[in-house]
Interface confidence: low
């Protein structure tokens, strides 16, 4: 992507770099994960060390709303974040080294779209450049995966089991075990983002307890084993 808006390009006796920006056409990631939007650039101001601003915007170039902005003081390699949409955007690259790569945390399906990087030199070499075609972020749904399953002490010398899974759409969780009615006793709550947690509040018998997570893309299961006659509960997945 070597197109953008070009202002006041300096002339040099030696051949100078032109403004250009390099971004991939597309980045794919699963909902709930993080993605990196790569962006590097070249510019004609060979030894520019003045103030600069790095910007990412969404939707459309030049006019789309900003999702990230940081500013570096003259001579500084630290780009101080001034805007990070809901705190989910973080600069990975070093703008002083021509790298504006951005990390997006906790992806949602709604994050799908086109993103545009931009750099502004605001010192003597007053200039700016922006990717015109941008990078397309495709956020895809995610099959379930169980991220934690455990047995914990409960009230009155009883035990309880917890199962946390993630996926998009958020998976439905179900417990099964040696005691009748265990699955119906599971308490399911909505967690953060794409994680859901189900609790089996009272494990009444020793044996294997299985947590199953399912959504439209698939299913996952994991088990814990309760052996109270061994003292502490043992777990296995």
């Amino acid at each position: 992507d070597a197109s953008g808006d070009l202002l006041n390009t300096e002339a040099h006796s030696a051949p100078a770099q032109r403004w250009s920006m390099q971004v991939p056409a597309e980045v794919n990631a699963e909902a709930g994960d993080a993605a990196v939007l790569p962006c590097t650039f070249t510019h004609p101001h060979r030894h520019y060390d003045g103030p600069l601003t790095a910007i990412w915007r969404s939707g459309e170039p030049y006019a789309g709303p900003q999702v990230f902005r940081c500013t570096a003081a003259p001579g500084s390699e630290l780009c101080q974040t001034a805007l990070s949409l809901h705190g989910r955007f973080r600069l990975l690259g070093n703008p002083r080294r021509n790298d504006l790569s951005l990390r997006v945390e906790r992806l949602a399906l709604a994050d799908s779209g086109r993103y545009f990087c931009r750099v502004e030199f605001t010192g003597d070499a007053h200039d700016r450049y922006e990717s015109r075609h941008g990078v397309r972020l495709r956020v895809t749904a995610a099959a379930p995966r169980i991220v934690n399953i455990s047995v914990l002490p409960g009230p009155a010398h009883a035990f309880r089991a917890l199962c946390t899974a993630e996926g998009e759409p958020p998976p439905a969780l179900a417990w099964s075990g040696p005691a009748p009615g265990n699955s119906s006793a599971a308490l399911q709550g909505q967690g953060h983002g794409y994680q859901v947690t189900a609790e089996l509040p009272a494990l009444t018998r020793d044996g294997r307890y299985t947590c199953t997570a399912a959504n439209s893309l698939g299913r996952a299961e994991a088990s814990v084993y309760l052996f109270r006659f061994h003292g502490a509960p043992g777990t296995s997945t």
């Epitope: 969404s58 939707g59 459309e60 170039p61 030049y62 006019a63 789309g64 709303p65 900003q66 999702v67 949409l85 809901h86 906790r106 949602a108 399906l109 709604a110 994050d111 779209g113 998009e168 759409p169 958020p170 909505q190 983002g193 794409y194």
Partner: antibody, heavy 122, light 107 residues
Framework: EVQLLESGGGLVQPGGSLRLSCAAS????????MSWVRQAPGKGLEWVST????????YYADSVKGRFTISRDNSKNTLYLQMNSLRAEDTAVYYC???????????????WGQGTMVTVSS | DIQMTQSPSSVSASVGDRVTITCRAS??????LAWYQQKPGKAPKLLIY???SLQSGVPSRFSGSGSGTDFTLTISSLQPEDFATYYC?????????FGQGTKLEIK
């Protein structure tokens, strides 16, 4: 002063047309997505349409798709809603609203106009 | 479309009371939820965005919480000017949708 000012409402017969305008001031208009939201008498809020800051992307509620057109003139700091084939159920106060400044697809509305009444009746 | 359901539809309370309004989405909307206050004959006013961020200029007695499908707006100590109708709105996906509103009335 940061504000939005709607105009163009009025009484129109079913099947008729109206063009609403929303004049913006006090902020960089072209940097923000803008929307129309309506409220029928005694009812709740209903999102109608959104347009991106540069005008390249537009979105509509199913109830108005094909009949309403959102547009903007960034040189005049003005948002428009062209309403054709109006129906009795389009009767409402129409508000223009500014996106808070996050992504166009994930925004709250932090600035609203005072609203303009559209009545569709024979 | 994502349906937003508010409860209660109306609530009576007194100045100084703590009031909680809930909003439930028909599917996971992460934290893409806003709360608005509207008084009769006036435009809505943004109170909370991204589920829990307080809009500039809004008193700190207003707070929002929740993520996924269940959200809460809390007014810690009601003031006379807080009696109004409150709406939640999801901005996870287009079409944006609002709750049906909760009318907060003086007891």
């Amino acid at each position: 002063e940061v504000q939005l000012l709607e105009s163009g409402g009025g009484l129109v017969q079913p099947g008729g047309s109206l063009r609403l305008s929303c004049a913006a001031s006090g902020f960089t208009f072209s940097s923000y997505a803008m929307s129309w939201v309506r409220q029928a008498p005694g009812k709740g809020l209903e999102w109608v349409s959104t347009i991106s800051g540069g005008g390249g992307s537009t979105y509509y509620a199913d109830s108005v798709k094909g009949r309403f057109t959102i547009s903007r003139d960034n040189s005049k700091n003005t948002l428009y809603l062209q309403m054709n084939s109006l129906r009795a159920e389009d009767t409402a106060v129409y508000y223009c609203a500014k996106a808070i400044g996050s992504s166009w697809y994930s925004d709250a509305f932090d600035l609203w106009g005072q609203g303009t009444m559209v009545t569709v009746s024979s | 479309d994502i349906q937003m359901t508010q409860s209660p539809s109306s609530v009576s309370a007194s100045v100084g009371d703590r009031v909680t309004i809930t909003c439930r989405a028909s599917q996971d909307i992460s934290s893409w939820l806003a709360w608005y206050q509207q008084k009769p004959g006036k435009a809505p006013k943004l109170l909370i965005y991204v589920a829990s961020s307080l809009q500039s200029g809004v008193p700190s007695r207003f707070s929002g919480s929740g993520s996924g499908t269940d959200f809460t707006l809390t007014i810690s100590s009601l003031q006379p000017e807080d009696f109004a109708t409150y709406y939640c709105q999801q901005s996870y996906s287009i079409p944006y949708t609002f709750g049906q509103g909760t009318k907060l009335e003086i007891k």
